[in-house]
């Protein structure tokens, strides 16, 4: 009987899917200088692998395209019944394509008050990301950077000292009380004020030097 | 033998309502459209309703149409005929009877004994 | 809706005779022309279908023919068992329609 290990060694192995991977293992490419490796791939091995991804990606696009078909099956047959025509004769089957008829101007009208309703909310939508532009266009906005920081570093340099109690939200969630709102408005106020305080270099180094 | 027995009927007075039922076998129920079909005491045959073989169609003549409703329970091998604002006009015998067609034309061709419905006040 | 109306509402004749009954349509429904049976206990059933095929089970002295309005169910050998009232039926449009009936009497 044959060992079923010693069959598998010597079949040629497939190539592992290759592996996504995320744009910062990229980073360093970019940033340090390396020299370039000689590839230990033959050509032919190469065009091995490549027809090997290429079938891969195939059969996934045929699987998807089945899937999207029996959705699509599953769909219509949950909205369209099937016809049940034994018994019927030609009498029936002219009244019930009128019904089908009627049924399909009933769905007509009804596509359309929703159309009509969907362009209203579009328009509206539009209005209002429009007045969203508008508004932010009244404000000075700084320019930003990318900067590595820590989130409680972030969170001393936003609310100062208040920075360790604002950590525990939910405890500090539960003492708010009807009175505070008052209070809390003032806050946001402040806090926005911070903000622009630090806007550009020179406001945050003062910050951080504190 | 293709068999059908029809129950339900009975005296009510104008506006009442009532439920018919036929009990079917001797055949597969759920391939067939069924029927309904009264007999007025004058002796006139009238058409009253039919329904498709899975009961997602059913035709009415205008008649009866929005007071009675034909339905079927296919795992029961029954048909329904649920009759509401019934007027004195309605009063008749009631056959249950199953469809068949031939070329386009349909007819009806196993009947029941009948079911008797008399409205009056 | 069509209107199916019979020549006459009741026939007499001896058994053993041949018989005639005629039914018309108000309009053209392309053989799609029923004949039922009711007996004098109320039980009915159905003899021709489509102009002139015989149902299963019935008698060949039975046969239909006609076509567009005019239609006729003829009865060759009159029996006893054949005394009862004949209904034509078209199922060309809804509502289905019945003539009035015609009775069959003996002479």
């Known amino acids: 009987m044959a060992d079923g290990s010693s069959d598998a060694a010597r079949e040629p192995r497939p190539a592992p899917a290759p592996i996504r991977r995320r744009s910062s293992n990229y980073r360093a490419y970019a940033t340090e200088p390396h020299a370039k490796k000689k590839s230990k791939i033959s050509a032919s091995r190469k065009l091995q692998l490549k027809t090997l991804l290429l079938q891969i990606a195939k059969q996934e696009l045929e699987r998807e395209a089945e899937e999207r078909r029996g959705e699509k099956g599953r769909a219509l047959s949950t909205r369209c019944q099937p016809l049940e025509l034994a018994g019927l004769g030609f009498a029936e089957l002219q009244d019930l394509c009128r019904q089908l008829h009627a049924r399909v101007d009933k769905v007509d009208e009804e596509r359309y008050d929703i159309e009509a309703k969907v362009t209203k909310n579009i328009t509206e939508i539009a209005d209002l990301t429009q007045k969203i532009f508008d508004l932010r266009g009244k404000f000075k906005r700084p320019t930003l950077r990318r900067v590595r920081i820590s989130a409680d570093a972030m969170m001393q340099a936003l609310l100062g000292a208040r920075a360790k109690e604002s950590l525990d939200l939910r405890a500090h969630l539960k003492q708010v009380k009807k009175e505070d709102t008052e209070k809390e408005n003032r806050e946001v106020g402040d806090w926005r004020k911070n903000i622009d305080a630090l806007s550009g270099m020179e406001g945050r180094k003062k910050k951080f030097e504190s | 033998e293709v068999q059908m027995v029809e129950s339900g009927g009975g005296l009510l007075k104008p506006g009442g309502s009532l439920k018919l039922s036929c009990a079917a076998s001797?055949?597969?129920?759920?391939?067939?459209?069924m029927s309904w079909v009264r007999q007025t005491p004058e002796k006139r045959l009238e058409w009253v309703a039919t329904?498709?073989?899975?009961?997602?169609?059913?035709f009415y003549p205008d008649s009866v149409k929005g007071r009675f409703t034909i339905s079927r329970d296919n795992a029961k091998n029954t048909l329904y005929l649920q009759m509401l604002s019934l007027r004195s006009e309605d009063t008749a015998m009631y056959y249950c009877?199953?469809?068949?067609?031939?070329?386009?034309?349909?007819?009806?061709?196993?009947w029941g004994q009948g079911s008797s419905v008399t409205v009056s006040s | 809706d069509i209107q199916m109306t019979q020549t006459s509402s009741s026939l007499s004749a001896s058994l053993g005779d041949r018989v005639t009954i005629s039914c018309r349509a108000s309009?053209?429904?392309?053989?799609?022309l029923n004949w039922y049976q009711q007996k004098p206990d109320g039980t009915i059933k159905l003899l021709i279908y489509y102009t002139s095929r015989i149902h299963s089970g019935v008698s060949s002295r039975f046969s239909g023919s006609g076509s567009g309005t005019d239609y006729s169910l003829t009865i060759s050998n009159l029996e006893q068992e054949d005394i009862a009232t004949y209904f034509c039926q078209q199922g060309h449009t809804i509502p289905l329609t019945f003539d009035t009936g015609t009775k069959l009497e003996l002479k």
């Open positions: 329904i498709s073989s899975g009961g997602s169609y059913s």
């Open positions: 309009q053209e429904i392309t053989n799609y």
């Open positions: 001797g055949f597969t129920y759920s391939n067939y459209a």
């Open positions: 009877a199953r469809r068949d067609n031939y070329y386009g034309s349909s007819f009806m061709d196993y």
